[in-house]
């Protein structure tokens, strides 16, 4: 009997008004629902305009809920990133400060006349750590070549050493091992330590970036219809007290977030790789031990050069010929006392252990973020019915929800009864983010094995100018050619959200 159906729309008025919409749209009593496009077409308290407004609102509310969940995860990753980044930078800055404080006394002019070379080394290490596309081994080789040239000139001020003689010295250097074992040891340890540190921090950056970009992926029109039906059609159909059935909600959100769930496998791989690489933070080649002790390798190298000076000079003369002597020049530099070495092993401060255990726990907590998202949003944001009973809203009426819950991911939505999902059309933004996760995981795996990978970012078009090896100048044979015409700019995923902090050092 139509008259008995014609109930008051007071409750709907209240809910609709509370959402900020004009009450003039709301009928006083139920009307026939043939005009409804989304909700079942029974008697209703919703006009076409109301249905459209509520559909838009439900869409916006889901996107907000999705962004809120993402923001919490992003904030956690950003906090982790900043903590680790601060710690690693602090280790390197500490080492440089120690060098600046102790080397003048220990080495005198052998340091002060070469302060710029040491400053440059630390700057390059900082840039490398921050994700610049430069080759660490080349950078170190270049530093030792510069230093040898300058120190050799300083130790022999009485000799005439033109560029061609210095070029010859540079070519002999590898065989002569003028700095003893320090360069080799530093190269092996620093490569492993810096690669581990920077790839871990970059991993946090990539993870955060992926979450941010995925949160911006718009929900499609089919999802909007399904969410409207889930959230507000009960109001329109006069059962505003009926809460959505849990399985019904899950099916809607699994359909809506099908593409997001496809991130799961690569997301887990990334987090696993990040947890794994923290193993490389300990021991004699560990991050804390190496990054904080760069200066001790440098001191060892200068001491070795001074100790080997006579043998080295004899070998250089043997390989490069007798240099001319400056008749007005001073005698050879007096042998300085050995620079006092701080112990090479830094006692662990405990800070890194604390950071790592916190990070591991938090990364484990968010491993299933993408596949648990539908369940999380349903239980936290959708005011679900507490049980799958006959009293919950099943999308048509108050009653039991019978369809089974779909699996996770796009392919499993083929028969989703609530959201029409075209499984042949994956979202391209999400596919790109899956690729970013894969790339970063590969970097971390390479880093775990101590290998520096080409950190050219996948999203980079690879363009850029530079003069490549281009050492066309006849005086630069000494230079270690920089294989990449690297622009030394930190990459997209170097450290998202952190400023580059290229210190302007002034005299």
């Amino acid at each position: 009997d139509p008259a008995s159906k014609s109930r008051s729309c007071g409750e709907v008025r209240q809910i609709y008004g509370a959402k900020g919409f004009s009450l003039s749209d709301v009928p006083q009593a139920e009307i026939s629902g043939e005009h409804l496009r989304i909700c079942p077409q029974g008697y209703t308290c919703c006009t076409s305009e109301m249905e459209e407004n509520l559909a838009n609102r439900s869409h916006a509310e889901l996107e907000t809920a999705l962004r809120d969940s993402s923001r919490v995860l992003q904030a956690m990753l950003a906090t982790q990133l900043r903590s680790f980044d601060d710690h690693f930078q602090h280790l390197l800055n500490d080492s440089e400060r120690t060098l600046q404080a102790t080397f003048p006394g220990a080495f005198g002019e052998l340091y002060t006349q070469n302060a710029r070379a040491f400053r440059d080394l630390y700057s390059e290490l900082r840039l490398y750590y921050r994700g610049a596309n430069l080759h660490l081994e080349e950078t170190l080789a270049e530093f030792w070549a510069r230093l040898l040239e300058r120190l050799f000139k300083q130790l022999h001020p009485q000799l005439l050493l033109p560029d061609d003689y210095l070029d010859c010295l540079g070519k002999q250097a590898e065989a002569l091992r003028p700095f003893g074992e320090a360069p080799r040891e530093l190269r092996l340890r620093a490569t492993r330590a810096f690669v581990a540190a920077r790839s871990f921090v970059q991993g946090l950056g990539v993870a955060s970036d992926v979450v941010r970009k995925v949160a911006q992926v718009p929900l499609g029109p089919e999802c909007s219809r399904a969410v409207m039906k889930l959230v507000y059609c009960a109001h329109c159909l006069g059962v505003p007290g009926a809460r959505p059935c849990p399985d019904y909600c899950r099916n809607v959100l699994k359909g809506c977030l099908a593409n997001q769930a496809d991130l799961d496998a690569e997301w887990r791989n990334l987090l696993d790789s990040m947890v794994l690489i923290t193993d490389k933070f300990w021991g004699t080649s560990g991050v804390e031990s190496v990054i904080g002790s760069v200066h001790t390798w440098l001191a060892e190298a200068i001491n070795a050069l001074q100790d080997n000076r006579d043998t080295l000079t004899a070998k250089v003369i043997q390989g490069c010929g007798n240099p001319k002597v400056n008749p007005q020049g001073p005698g050879p530099e007096e042998k300085r006392r050995r620079g006092k070495l701080a112990p090479r092993e830094r006692p662990p401060s405990g800070t890194l252990e604390k950071l790592v255990s916190e990070a591991k726990a938090q990364l484990r907590d968010v491993q299933d973020f993408w596949i648990s998202l539908p369940g999380t949003l349903c239980s936290e944001k959708m005011a679900l019915s507490t049980a799958s009973d006959d009293r919950c809203w099943n999308g048509m009426a108050r009653g039991r929800y019978l369809p089974e819950v779909m699996g996770d991911g796009l392919a499993n939505q083929i028969n989703n009864p609530e959201v029409e999902v075209d499984i042949t059309k994956p979202d391209m933004t999400i596919r790109q983010q899956i690729m970013q996760l894969k790339i970063m995981t590969n970097r971390l795996r390479s880093a775990y094995n101590g290998n520096d990978v080409d950190f050219q970012d996948a999203s980079d078009d690879g363009s850029g100018s530079g003069s490549g090896d281009g050492c066309l100048d006849d005086l630069c044979s000494r230079k270690v050619s920089r294989k990449s015409s690297s622009s030394r700019t930190p990459l997209t995923h170097a450290l998202p959200g952190l400023s580059e902090q290229e210190g302007q050092k002034t005299s």
Partner: antibody
């Protein structure tokens, strides 16, 4: 061969700023320090500062420290020198010069940029 | 800052003459001393680096000597193209500094 090509002459009013560019070619840009040296009309040479194109680190002559900024753009192999709060005494030819090797020796020079400061 | 003093400020000489220019540093700079030649309206050109090394492409009539605080640039036989201003420069410490220049004119 190594070439340093500077931007054209500038006329500025006192108090203004000037930004001179120096585009490098013929070598690995990030491999050598670049310096700026100026020469007032009929005067000698005066070193203003240096920049490491690889890291962006700079060292300035104390005399100019408050007014000079040196930057680089590695994608175009260009260094820049900006001098602010110009006064008439800043009228000079400004040269960029590349080190020979890591030694503070200026083996390659730009053609110079005349900056005239006049009201 | 290290002060560099050149002498003489100017000199007149004839083609074929032997010319000597001196440069004194206000403190010892080892051999971190370099010589440049500059012609009117042109950029300076490196002649000698590290006190005594001849830059590639520079004629062998130019030579340098000295160490510590006193340095000399010698042109063994002055040529017409050598009439120019000559500057010394130290790279021992920043700020790098130049001498005030020595102008070599035709007698």
């Amino acid at each position: 061969q190594v070439q340093l090509v500077q931007s054209g002459a500038e006329v500025k009013k006192p108090g203004a700023s000037v930004k001179v560019s120096c585009k490098a070619s013929g070598y690995t840009f990030t491999g050598y320090y670049m310096h700026w040296v100026r020469q007032a009309p009929g005067q000698g040479l005066e070193w203003m500062g240096e920049i490491n194109p690889s890291t962006g680190d700079t060292t300035y002559n104390q005399k100019f420290k408050a007014r000079v900024t040196m930057t680089r753009d590695t994608s175009t192999s260009t260094v820049y020198m900006e001098l602010s709060s110009l006064r008439s005494e800043d009228t000079a030819v400004y040269y960029c010069a590349r080190e020979k090797r890591d030694d503070g020796v200026f083996a390659y020079w730009g053609q110079g940029t005349l900056v005239t400061v006049s009201s | 800052a290290i002060r560099m003093t050149q002498s003489p400020s100017s000199l007149s000489a004839s083609v074929g003459d032997r010319v000597t220019i001196t440069c004194r540093a206000s403190r010892s700079i080892s051999t971190y001393l370099h010589w440049y030649q500059q012609k009117a309206g042109k950029a300076p050109k490196l002649l000698i680096y590290s006190a005594y090394n001849l830059q590639s492409g520079v004629p062998s009539r130019f030579s340098g000597s000295g160490s510590g605080t006193d340095f000399t640039l010698t042109i063994s036989s002055l040529q017409p193209e050598d009439f120019a201003t000559y500057y010394c420069q130290q790279s021992y410490s920043t700020p790098y500094t130049f001498g005030q220049g020595t102008k070599v004119e035709i007698k």
